[in-house]
């Protein structure tokens, strides 16, 4: 069984490890982290803000970020619900990911097509990445129109979470 | 290598384990299941239907749930691909999420805005979810507009997802 | 600990390991492949290209595809931004996930609902797969109205990721 | 054993709208798409669009402005309509049909049932 | 979209093999394994010969076979008979969901 010796691997021998099997297991990419947060009640700036009391594990959440605390390879995900009275106009709706404080991915719909009068519409926008993170990395949303994030009828539907896909021990 | 001792990393000392090195093989989180699942050909109502000759690993399927077999925390995601023959008014497609029969989350987007006489409009609709699972907990999936999920022009678009991250034994 | 002898678990006792603890460790699931690319910058044709300086590990990019290199289950994902300029009639955007030139998944979505004259509207589209890869296997993505990918503007948004979840050795 | 056969005029004047229909016999409509192809004599093969049961169309972008399909699952019948014609459109028209299938993939079995095809010509 | 390329004619003798070419782009031919071949007889319908660039339908002889490489797919006749003297055409699946023909090969059994 040919597995490379790469850093994600186990060096079953040689390395440092040799035939200490204490240490074999200790370099084994066993370590987890995650976090699945909902949204926060109140809204009031295009930062957002998230419920600290969800699930959190190997990661810390501090003042609207998402804190990295083992460093390695994250999935992270984030999904919005908005919820727009239609304007006159057309409405562009972002979702920014940022990564100590740069955008590193957004996306971006159109809803409420020019003229159309309807009283409400729904959308739902969602945005990944992949992406290596060291200790203490943040990670944030942004939403220009944050205001169209409904809270009150939809408290479940908006959420940040990460998991850690390889940690880079 | 400061890997914190708790329950999804491997107790390399004390514990229950100690130096046992099978027992701490036991104890690493080596468990996987997972799930892809697409939808069934004839849909009769708004609980989906799905084939059950999909993969299927370490989960069980049973009357248009998935069944947890393993406990631990899974990630979850559903993707449903509609088409709609707009009527007059604007239609409101909502995909929802249940575990063990409650709605844990749900999408929403509004299509056909008002007074638009299209011939037909695709929309595309997923829903993710990372959650700790137990034992026989059910997954399934409603949607009230059953009748725009079109499975016979894109039987392969429609599927429901699993796997299992971190297990907790 | 009830662990089911199946090819992703580690076979504790008996099979061809039995009590050697190197054998054990080699068969454990430890091989991890990932990538995560960007979309290229100018495009010129159906079959989406990718930077190939992105995130590639234990994976191969060549002439468009990712190239299989470690076979396993692969979660596979793809997400695109769209700009499209309206024209006087609706737009279908779609995605296609291709495994080895053959059609494996697609996601449509309309924009431009008929009559609608709009500057602009943004879309973003994705879509997910879970597959068993053999080594060698080849995933492309093929977008028709790649005219409307704006990877001037969005020159981060638009990427093709995969992980290995499970491998098969 | 599925069987096809094309009805209709063969002889439309310029710039007026060819109607044609399939009836399929022996067989469902269902779960197929359906096409038209047409062959001007001493010519090739040029594929003219597709419809499904469902009601999704594909058509040729060189002639999308002027066709319309449409299916009637009722009758078991699918047929087409090219308005504006010109003596370019004269031809043999044949109804086929296409067999896709999902399965773990996307399944494309080609055009497996052909009508015997009708000639239609244009001329004032 | 434009026509598939295919010589306009081939010949052989009864017991040879022959192969016939047909290049797309890679919006069609090297976009997809969807490649079909067609064989038609004067005055008849087509019939589908090879799917999928190599896929035989059931009652088709095994003397046909198809390949595809790049943006060209080949369709090889092998032990040529006198009944497979007829037109061959291609098709191909494209990125915007319809299918287009090539502009058709006449087989000619010497």
């Known amino acids: 069984d040919s597995i490379p010796n790469s850093p994600d691997n186990v060096p079953l021998k040689g390395g440092d490890c040799s035939e200490d099997l204490l240490c074999i297991l200790k370099r084994a990419p066993f370590k987890k982290s995650w976090a699945y947060l909902q949204v926060a009640k109140h809204l009031d700036k295009t930062k957002l803000s998230w419920n600290k009391d969800g699930i959190l594990h190997g990661v810390r959440y501090q003042d609207g970020n998402l804190v990295i605390q083992f460093p390695g390879l994250y999935f992270i995900i984030c999904q919005l619900q908005f919820l727009v009275q239609c304007p006159q106009n057309s409405v562009d709706l972002k979702l920014e990911l940022l990564i100590n404080k740069h955008i590193k991915k957004q996306a971006l719909v159109t809803v409420c097509e020019s003229g159309m009068q309807t009283k409400h519409v729904y959308q739902n926008l969602s945005q990944f990445l992949l992406d290596y993170l060291q200790v203490d990395t943040t990670i944030s949303v942004n939403v220009d129109t944050f205001q169209y994030i409904d809270t009150s009828t939809f408290p479940l539907e908006n959420v940040l979470s990460i998991f850690l896909y390889s940690n880079s021990d | 290598d400061s890997i914190p001792n708790s329950p999804d990393n491997v107790p390399l000392k004390g514990g229950d384990c100690s130096e046992d090195l099978l027992c701490i093989l036991k104890r690493a989180p080596f468990k996987k299941s997972w799930a892809y699942l697409q939808v069934a050909k004839h849909l009769d109502k708004t609980k989906l239907s799905w084939n059950k000759d999909g993969i299927l690993h370490g989960v069980r399927y049973q009357d248009g749930n998935l069944v947890i077999q393993f406990p631990g925390l899974y990630f979850i995601i559903c993707q449903l691909q509609f088409l709609v023959q707009c009527p007059q008014n604007s239609v409101d497609l909502k995909l929802e999420l249940l575990i063990n029969k409650h709605i844990k989350k749900q999408a929403l987007v509004t299509v056909c805005e008002s007074g638009m006489q299209t011939k037909h409009v695709y929309q595309n609709l997923s829903q993710f979810l990372l959650d700790y699972l137990q034992v026989d907990t059910t997954i399934s999936v409603n949607v009230d507009t059953f009748q725009y999920i079109d499975t016979s022009t894109f039987p392969l678009e429609n599927v429901l997802s699993i796997f299992l991250y971190s297990n907790s034994d | 600990d009830s662990i089911p002898n199946s090819p992703d678990n580690v076979p504790l006792k008996g099979g061809d390991c039995s009590e050697d603890l190197l054998c054990i460790l080699k068969r454990a699931p430890f091989k991890k492949s990932w990538a995560y690319l960007q979309v290229a910058k100018h495009l010129d044709k159906t079959k989406l290209s990718w930077n190939k300086d992105g995130i590639l590990h234990g994976v191969r990019y060549q002439d468009g595809n990712l190239v299989i290199q470690f076979p396993g289950l692969y979660f596979i994902i793809c997400q695109l931004q769209f700009l499209v300029q309206c024209p006087q009639n609706s737009v279908d955007l779609k995605l296609e996930l291709l495994i080895n030139k053959h059609i494996k998944k697609q996601a449509l979505v309309t924009v431009c609902e008929s009559g609608m004259q709009t500057k602009h509207v943004y879309q973003n589209l994705s879509q997910f797969l879970l597959d068993y890869l053999q080594v060698d296997t080849t995933i492309s993505v093929n977008v028709d109205t790649f005219q409307y990918i704006d990877t001037s503007t969005f020159p981060l948004e638009n990427v093709l990721s995969i992980f290995l979840y499970s491998n098969s050795d | 054993q599925v069987q096809l056969q094309e009805s209709g005029p063969g002889l439309v004047k310029p710039s007026e709208t060819l109607s044609l229909t399939c009836t399929v016999s022996?067989?469902?409509?269902?779960?197929?798409?359906w096409t038209w192809i047409r062959q001007p004599a001493g010519k090739g093969l040029e594929w003219i669009g597709r419809i499904y049961t469902s009601g999704i169309t594909n058509y040729n972008p060189s002639l999308k402005s002027r066709v319309t399909m449409s299916v009637d699952t009722s009758k078991n019948q699918f047929s087409l309509k090219l308005s504006s014609v010109t003596a370019a459109d004269t031809a043999v028209y044949y109804c086929?049909?296409?067999?896709?299938?999902?399965?773990?993939?996307?399944?494309?079995?080609?055009?497996?049932?052909w009508g015997q095809g009708t000639t239609v010509t244009v001329s004032s | 979209q434009s026509a598939l390329t295919q010589p306009a004619s081939v010949s052989g003798s009864p017991g040879q093999s022959i192969t016939i070419s047909c290049t797309g782009t890679?919006?069609?031919?090297?976009?997809?394994?969807?490649v079909s071949w067609y064989q038609q007889h004067p005055d008849k319908a087509p019939k589908l010969m090879i799917f999928e660039v190599n896929n035989r339908p059931s009652g088709v002889s095994n003397r046909f076979s198809g390949s595809n490489s790049g943006n060209t797919a080949s369709l090889t006749i092998s032990g040529l008979q006198a009944e497979d003297e007829a037109d061959y055409y291609c098709?191909?699946?494209?990125?915007?969901?319809?299918?287009?023909f090539g502009g058709g090969t006449k087989l000619t059994v010497l």
């Open positions: 890679s919006s069609d031919v090297g976009l997809y394994n969807y």
């Open positions: 086929a049909r296409e067999r896709v299938v999902g399965a773990s993939r996307y399944y494309y079995y080609g055009v497996d049932v």
């Open positions: 098709s191909s699946y494209t990125s915007s969901s319809t299918w287009v």
């Open positions: 022996g067989g469902s409509i269902s779960s197929y798409y």
